[in-house]
Interface confidence: low
């Protein structure tokens, strides 16, 4: 009898069972060792099992696959390629599995994959072709709709001698494969900047989460093409002010909600346009929570309470009067 439950409850597969049949081709509905399976829910959970590789004998029915809390280290090309293919796999969660390398074509042969979560893995080496699967200038469109990449930044001493932002963006843009992506989460990655071309090439985005990074400015970022964008999370960054160009672009997005809490806003003369805009706009959620961080005399003032007389800039001293 099959070790897979046909009820909605999960059944576990004993390790000895997997080893006993390892010489034979796996049964299509077999549950891998150290996993729990529910055929009724089309779900397989191999969670917190210290697995070092993706199980080979995943059941063909799987739609939702949880491989969280393991020790996978490397995701090779075709890590999920099977015969027959895992044609129904739609949601794949690999968070917290100590992945430090995702190779080109790691997610190939997953025609229905719509949600992918790689969060909380120290990705020192994310191939530019991890999501596109090929190095062609235009790849076959990826079926991905949601890509969750929160806290994938490796420790500083493990980073390659290249921009981490650049590595991630290269993977997002390769082959224009992710044109259908609707949700992209890049929170908690120490991003210092957002490469200017990234958003222009993800025109289907509905939700973009860049919270808890180190973004200082959005001056060179364009949101103009993101006409479907519904939520933009910029909380907990290092933003000092939003300039007119950015304000106008955000205001022009028909469905947008922007989240700006916990940024160190500098309330000097350069803030006047943003304060005026905040008083007018409906796009900023919780706008009455935004407070000044600098200069010291303005600290904790609520931006919406400010008037133009509050927002002054100290005159620039001639060089002879400046002190270091």
């Amino acid at each position: 009898s099959s070790p897979t439950s046909s009820a909605s409850s999960f059944s576990s597969s004993a390790p000895f069972l997997a080893s006993a049949v390892s010489a034979q081709p796996p049964l299509p509905d077999q549950c891998p060792a150290l996993c729990e399976c529910s055929e009724a829910a089309r779900t397989v959970k191999c969670v917190n099992r210290n697995l070092t590789e993706v199980p080979t004998d995943l059941p063909a029915y799987v739609r939702n696959l949880f491989l969280t809390g393991n020790q996978l280290a490397v995701l090779p090309a075709g890590a999920f390629a099977r015969r027959p293919p895992l044609a129904e796999l739609a949601a794949l969660n690999l968070s917290g599995s100590r992945l430090d390398e995702v190779r080109a074509g790691a997610f190939e042969h997953l025609p229905s994959l719509r949600q992918l979560d790689l969060s909380h893995n120290p990705l020192a080496d994310l191939s530019p072709f991890a999501f596109s699967g090929s190095n062609a200038s235009v790849s076959a469109p990826s079926p991905l709709v949601e890509l969750i990449l929160n806290h994938i930044v490796p420790p500083e001493d493990e980073r390659q001698n290249r921009s981490f932002e650049g590595m991630v963006v290269a993977a997002l843009l390769a082959g224009r494969a992710l044109q259908g992506l609707r949700r992209l989460e890049l929170a908690s990655n120490h991003f210092l900047y957002l490469p200017r071309d990234v958003l222009a090439q993800l025109p289907s985005l509905r939700h973009l989460d860049l919270s808890n990074n180190s973004l200082v400015s959005l001056t060179y970022v364009s949101f103009r093409n993101l006409t479907h964008l519904e939520s933009l999370h910029l909380e907990d960054n290092a933003l000092k002010v939003l300039h007119n160009g950015t304000l106008a672009e955000l205001q022009g997005l028909p469905h947008i909600r922007v989240f700006l809490d916990n940024n160190p806003w500098v309330c000097d003369c350069h803030m006047a346009d943003m304060v005026t805009w905040l008083k007018e706009t409906e796009v900023v959620q919780g706008k009455d929570r935004l407070t000044c961080a600098y200069p010291e005399k303005m600290r904790n003032r609520v931006l919406l309470e400010l008037n133009s007389a509050d927002l002054d800039c100290d005159p620039i001293l001639p060089p002879s009067l400046q002190t270091s």
Epitope: K279, E280, T281, N300, L304, E305, D310
Partner: antibody, heavy 117, light 111 residues
Framework: EVQLQESGAEMVRPGASVKLSCKAS????????MHWVKQRPGQGLEWIGK????????QYNQKFKDKATLTVDKSSITVYMELNSLTSEDSAVYYC??????????WGQGTLVTVSA | DIVMTQSPASLAVSLGQRATISCRAS??????????MHWYQQKPGQSPKLLIT???NLESGVPARFSGSGSGTDFTLNIHPVEEEDIATYYC?????????FGGGTKLEIK
């Protein structure tokens, strides 16, 4: 349930000082500003100032800048207002009120201060 | 400072009728989308209670017979139908800039 418990009524001499307290409960104390509002008998409301419960940063109505001093004790989740150089003009009910960012969401019961020789 | 002027100073209304209280700011406290005007109710011997934020947003728990409207410099609080428990003084408050200021209050009585 949010509650703001203010100290009892005070009768003080002209020229003296008084320190009022406001003890908070029922919410995350450090997440909100605490405001103080003055109401003279039979009259309207005047905003005195506010204090950030998390870092003691204050902001005052210029009219009260030399009259009131706001402080906070996070360990006892209590905010204080000291009024100095009291005159009969300072006789009033003083309310602490928890901020709702741009309004006063919750109010204490008020402390009556009477300045009389 | 922005000066808030309420009228009338007192108002007597029959039960079940409409009470209308006006508040005028000495400068605009609105943008095209938001009005930074809020209303409070203070019953005799009690602390003020928040009724309405942003000129027209009813606080939870406040009866639907209360409504607020207006923009720019002119704002109105309506109570309809007036009930016995509405006997109180009503205050408007702006939060356009520091210092926040209140109107002088309107005392509502029953005829």
């Amino acid at each position: 349930e949010v509650q703001l418990q203010e100290s009892g009524a005070e009768m003080v001499r002209p020229g003296a000082s008084v320190k009022l307290s406001c003890k908070a409960s029922g919410y995350t104390f450090t997440s909100y500003w605490m405001h103080w509002v003055k109401q003279r008998p039979g009259q309207g409301l005047e905003w005195i100032g506010k204090i950030d419960s998390s870092d003691s940063k204050t902001q005052y109505n210029q009219k009260f800048k030399d009259k009131a001093t706001l402080t906070v004790d996070k360990s006892s989740i209590t905010v204080y207002m000291e009024l100095n150089s009291l005159t009969s003009e300072d006789s009033a009910v003083y309310y602490c009120a928890r901020g709702g960012y741009l309004w006063f969401a919750y109010w204490g019961q008020g402390t009556l201060v009477t300045v009389s020789a | 400072d922005i000066v808030m002027t309420q009228s009338p100073a007192s108002l007597a209304v029959s039960l079940g009728q409409r009470a209308t209280i006006s508040c005028r700011a000495s400068q605009s406290v609105s943008t095209s989308t938001y009005s930074y005007m809020h209303w409070y109710q203070q019953k005799p011997g009690q602390s003020p209670k928040l009724l309405i934020t942003y000129a027209s947003n009813l606080e939870s728990g406040v009866p639907a017979r209360f409504s607020g409207s207006g923009s720019g410099t002119d704002f109105t609080l309506n109570i309809h139908p007036v009930e016995e428990e509405d006997i109180a003084t009503y205050y408007c408050q702006h939060s356009w800039e520091i210092p926040w200021t209140f109107g002088g209050g309107t005392k509502l009585e029953i005829k």
